[in-house]
């Protein structure tokens, strides 16, 4: 079966047909009838239920609401009710761009290694009993291949490979015709062995702070795609409320490693946090590093040498 | 020949009940959503249903001028869906239709429709 739709914040292009499937659906358990709800919320209107009296695009199954298609207007909040459980969704609905095949935000991008192995399959679960034919496009020139059901490239990668590849499937119901488009953006890379990971910049910092203030520890690496990078403070993480993890940036090189970093926030700086170790560490299958910050108070500074601070 | 047959309308005072029937003939009802429609008098029929039960039985969807008074369920071995109406109000008087689609949606994207049945609330 279809997984359900986990994630909270979803940005879909207009025209297409959607779908959000709550994730309460067991359907073994439900034996009797129950009695569930679809709202929407955007802006001015506050929760208005949704049923074809408020878009006749809707339908409604046991767990799934659907829209045919899915239009600029539907951008909102929307919220499934049964009983005494609750799901959350924020949609966010975009133009399409007519001038493409497809729609540069909604493209996902994937990184293969020359001469590895080179994948792309046209398939969609959910509307797949309605698809008609589904076509491969590649920088947005169709490809001509064999099964017009689920389209598929299997190679061993060239760089010729790189570029947008577009999967449309067409699909028919109650009598109109659709599409659904999903767009990968490949990218082809020299052979990357892996590297031992590196934080970059001084073992230990000592970084001038004031009480009452917040500072952000700014910690980076250049790592492998897989390895990863965590901040280690105090007794037990997460236990002093006014720290605070960022979430992690990460920004390909163009060598195929990648460029991370990740802040750890204090806030309204107290005693406790003064003269304390906050380590950032980056662990891979090779081993791991590990750098280190010292909040120091601005009036001690002069105990220790200038060379060592950072800002 | 296939069918949609609503039974069970007729005449019922403000605050009673009724209990409307929709029987299927030449197909099984059980692989479809039945959503239930009003048709006022001197209106058109409603595009949007007033109470729909999935195929499976499971989910039931209402509106919200009929939700905590109607009632919808469906018997697949009799192959029959009822609406049980309580606390009927005078503009509950309509003709009710009972049409079978893949899903609870709007009128245009049903496949088969009953005949209708009338359900009139005095005052």
């Known amino acids: 079966a279809e997984s359900c739709t986990s994630r909270p914040h979803i940005t879909v292009v207009e025209g297409e047909p959607f779908y959000l499937k709550h994730c309460s659906c067991s359907l073994a358990h439900e034996i009797e009838t129950t009695t569930k709800s679809w709202y929407k919320s955007s802006g001015s209107q506050e929760h208005v239920e949704l049923n074809p009296r408020s878009s006749s695009r809707i339908a409604l199954h046991d767990c799934v609401l659907e829209f045919w298609p899915v239009e600029l207007n539907d951008t909102g909040s929307y919220f499934f009710q049964m009983k005494n459980y609750t799901q959350k969704w924020k949609l966010n609905v975009i133009r399409r761009n007519k001038h493409s095949c497809f729609t540069e935000r909604q493209v996902t991008s994937k990184i293969v290694e020359v001469k590895k192995f080179f994948q792309i399959t046209c398939e969609n679960s959910y509307y797949q009993t309605l698809v008609n034919s589904t076509s491969l496009y590649k920088n947005c020139k169709k490809l001509l291949l064999e099964n017009n059901k689920n389209p598929t490239i299997k190679k061993n990668a060239e760089f010729e490979d790189q570029g947008y590849y577009s999967c449309v499937h067409f699909l028919h119901h109650n009598g109109k015709l659709f599409n659904i488009t999903k767009t990968f953006n490949i990218t082809i890379v020299e052979d990357r062995s892996n590297i031992v990971p590196v934080l970059l910049g001084p073992k230990l910092n000592h970084v001038a702070v004031e009480l009452g203030k917040n500072v952000r520890l700014n910690c980076s690496a250049l790592l492998n795609e897989e390895d990863v990078i965590y901040w280690m403070f105090g007794e037990e993480n997460g236990s002093d409320p006014n720290i605070h993890e960022e979430k992690e940036m990460r920004i390909m090189t163009p060598e195929g490693k990648w460029h991370a970093s990740k802040v750890l926030r204090i806030e309204n700086i107290g005693e406790s946090n003064l003269n304390v170790l906050y380590n950032c560490t980056v662990a891979s299958t090779g081993g791991t590093d590990t750098k280190s910050f010292i909040l120091v108070r601005k009036a001690d500074m002069a105990d220790i040498p200038g060379h060592v601070f950072t800002r | 020949d296939v069918q949609l047959q609503e039974s069970g309308g007729g005449l019922v005072q403000a605050g009673g009940s009724l209990r409307l029937s929709c029987a299927a003939s030449g197909f099984t009802l059980g692989a479809y959503a039945i959503n239930w429609f009003r048709q006022a008098p001197g209106k058109e029929r409603a595009r949007a249903w007033d109470a729909c039960i999935t195929s499976s039985g499971r989910s039931a969807y209402y509106a919200d001028s009929v939700k905590g008074r109607f009632t919808v369920s469906r018997d697949h071995a009799k192959n029959t869906v009822y609406l049980q109406m309580n606390s009927l109000k005078p503009e509950d008087t309509a003709f009710y239709y009972c049409?079978?689609?893949?899903?609870?949606?709007?009128?245009?994207?049903?496949?088969?429709w009953g005949k209708g049945t009338l359900v009139t609330v005095s005052s």
């Open positions: 049409a079978a689609g893949a899903a609870c949606a709007a009128a245009g994207t049903m496949n088969y």
